[in-house]
Interface confidence: low
């Protein structure tokens, strides 16, 4: 019968010929009367056989990632009779893996959006690299992820590539971050190959800023001839948030005279001071009112940033109109 062990040849061998192994019939007594033949895809081009000894050699550099095994056939013939000594047999030469492929991030570009002020541990995104080397061959395709850029705001789980927040971020200070992740094979041991990817992380706004009046004092005038409903001026607050988190509502906090009202222009985000009752210069020639501003939408969990509304003082001077 045939005698052989499993055949392996390392990929990417630079030698002109590499001894793979030996085919032998147990009927071969070593008197050189047997002739060994190699058949099948790769025989004669990739692999050759010493017909006398049955030794097999690889004569080409192999790439496991291109082809990981070769199925060949072996024959042994008695030279004196020209007959087969053994039945033709199929055997396999496996190409063994070396670490010749770096990890690659196939889903680039990566982009994620996460709310500002998110707590430590919040999941941002998972990045995944793949390695063409053999996952069953040692650590050639076992990857470890690490953060090259993004500290101290982000961290990456070494084995999963999950990026998490590690420090609170304020969108109003910086609204996006570039994080660079490295994947190393060989679980980071010497000889490891690496690949990197960039992740753009954008911060979405949360309502962590209350609106604040631009001025602590406004001065307005109203004619004593102005009818009720007249707009006598505008006041304005600013809010460092964006979108609906910056929408605000103005109102009267203090007006003992109950002469004025404030309505909100939601398009311009201004407060419009309205005359609610006619004024009379002789009766009262100036008024002081206090206005406040609050966000229109406030998440209950963010109430701590909105416990005290910003206020402003408005001095209103009544203009005298000559009466006939």
């Amino acid at each position: 019968g045939w005698v052989w062990n499993q055949f392996f040849v390392p990929e990417e061998m630079n030698t002109t010929s590499h001894h793979v192994g030996r085919l032998r019939s147990d009927l071969d007594n070593g008197n050189n009367s047997f002739q060994y033949k190699l058949l099948g895809a790769g025989a004669g081009s990739t692999f050759i056989i010493d017909e006398r000894t049955g030794d097999i050699y690889a004569i080409e550099k192999l790439d496991r990632e291109e082809r990981s095994l070769y199925i060949l056939r072996a024959q042994v013939i008695d030279i004196t009779t020209g007959r087969a000594v053994e039945p033709e047999s199929e055997f396999v030469i496996k190409v063994s893996d070396i670490n010749d492929n770096e990890p690659k991030f196939l889903d680039e570009p990566y982009e994620a959006i996460v709310p500002e002020m998110s707590p430590e541990g919040t999941l941002v995104i998972q990045v995944t690299a793949s390695d063409a080397d053999d996952p069953s061959s040692g650590n050639n395709a076992r990857l470890l992820y690490s953060l090259l850029q993004g500290q101290p705001y982000f961290s990456v789980e070494p084995t999963t590539g999950v990026i998490r927040i590690s420090s609170k971020m304020d969108r109003e200070l910086q609204d996006e971050y570039w994080v660079i992740i490295q994947a190393k094979d060989m679980i980071g041991q010497p000889g490891a190959l690496s690949g990197t990817t960039s992740v753009l992380i954008k911060l979405s706004d949360v309502n962590d800023n209350k609106p604040i009046f631009k001025e602590s004092l406004y001065r307005l005038t109203v004619s004593e001839s102005a009818p009720t409903g007249t707009s006598i001026g505008t006041i304005m607050a600013y809010d460092n948030d964006i979108g609906e988190n910056a929408e605000m509502d103005y109102s009267i906090e203090e007006d003992d005279s109950q002469t004025f009202d404030i309505i909100t222009n939601h398009e311009t985000q201004e407060g419009i001071v309205i005359l609610k009752k006619k004024v009379n210069f002789e009766h009262q020639n100036h008024y002081g009112i206090r206005a406040k501003v609050k966000n229109h939408h406030v998440d209950e969990q963010l109430m701590k940033y909105h416990t005290e509304a910003s206020t402003t003082f408005i001095k209103i001077q009544v203009e005298d109109v000559d009466e006939p």
């Epitope: 707590p119 430590e120 101290p152 420090s167 609170k168 304020d170 200070l173 962590d208 800023n209 209350k210 209950e300 969990q301 109430m303 701590k304 940033y305 416990t307």
Partner: antibody
Framework: QVQLVESGGGVVQPGGSLRLSCAAS????????MHWVRQAPGKGLEWVAV????????YYAESVKGRFTISRDTSKNTLYLQMNSLRAEDTAVYYC????????????WGQGTLVTVSS | EIVLTQSPGTLSLSPGERATLSCRAS???????LAWYQQKPGQAPRLLIY???SRATGIPDRFSGSGSGTDFTLTISSLEPEDFAVYYC????????FGQGTKVEIK
């Protein structure tokens, strides 16, 4: 380990001023909202003021509004309480406290510094 | 502001007994934003419970919190000698306010 150490307490006359400090260590000071809480001798706890982690928002109890100012210096990892127009009823042990990261309770407190307002 | 009322003012118990402390709010405390603190003489308060029922880091499981809305309870299942102290509840639903405290003393 997290440490908060208050200083600056002492005896002051009514109408006087005092500035308390709270040195923070063992955590990322700039990531946490910080508070002052006081306790009059033999009495309960009273919340005084809070400052947001980035120092842009401050809120005060009605009893101290307009007289006390809370501030912070991130470069020095220090929280401050400037107390003006002090009254006898401000006599208390003043504690600085760190607000818990995931909610609004106070997970770490300093040992306190005693402020006595007396003529 | 939300006013918190604790009862009883003083609780006299022996080691090994169960302690039940009550805290009532003048209006509903949203999202169970209520904490319990322990304070021993000459020391700073120590956080025991947050979110009405979650134990803070390092707090033994004999301490438990419950309740919602306006009625909250701190229970110490079996008093240890080191548990005799003053206990404060605190709401952080709307600004921050504390109860007046309950003293747990040795009977």
């Amino acid at each position: 380990q997290v440490q908060l150490v208050e200083s600056g307490g002492g005896v002051v006359q009514p109408g006087g001023s005092l500035r308390l400090s709270c040195a923070a260590s063992g955590f990322t000071f700039s990531s946490y909202d910080m508070h002052w809480v006081r306790q009059a001798p033999g009495k309960g706890l009273e919340w005084v003021a809070v400052i947001s982690y980035e120092g842009t928002n401050e809120y005060y109890a009605e009893s101290v509004k307009g007289r006390f100012t809370i501030s912070r210096d991130t470069s020095k990892n220090t929280l401050y309480l400037q107390m003006n127009s002090l009254r006898a009823e401000d006599t208390a042990v003043y504690y600085c406290a760190r607000e818990r990261y995931f909610d609004w309770s106070f997970d770490y407190w300093g040992q306190g510094t005693l402020v006595t307002v007396s003529s | 502001e939300i006013v918190l009322t604790q009862s009883p003012g003083t609780l006299s118990l022996s080691p090994g007994e169960r302690a039940t402390l009550s805290c009532r709010a003048s209006q509903s405390v949203s999202n169970t934003y209520l904490a319990w603190y322990q304070q021993k003489p000459g020391q700073a308060p120590r956080l025991l419970i947050y979110g009405a029922s979650s134990r803070a880091t390092g707090i033994p499981d004999r301490f438990s919190g419950s309740g919602s809305g306006t009625d909250f309870t701190l229970t110490i299942s079996s008093l240890e000698p080191e548990d005799f102290a003053v206990y404060y509840c605190q709401q952080y639903s709307n600004s921050w306010t504390f109860g007046q405290g309950t003293k747990v003393e040795i009977k």
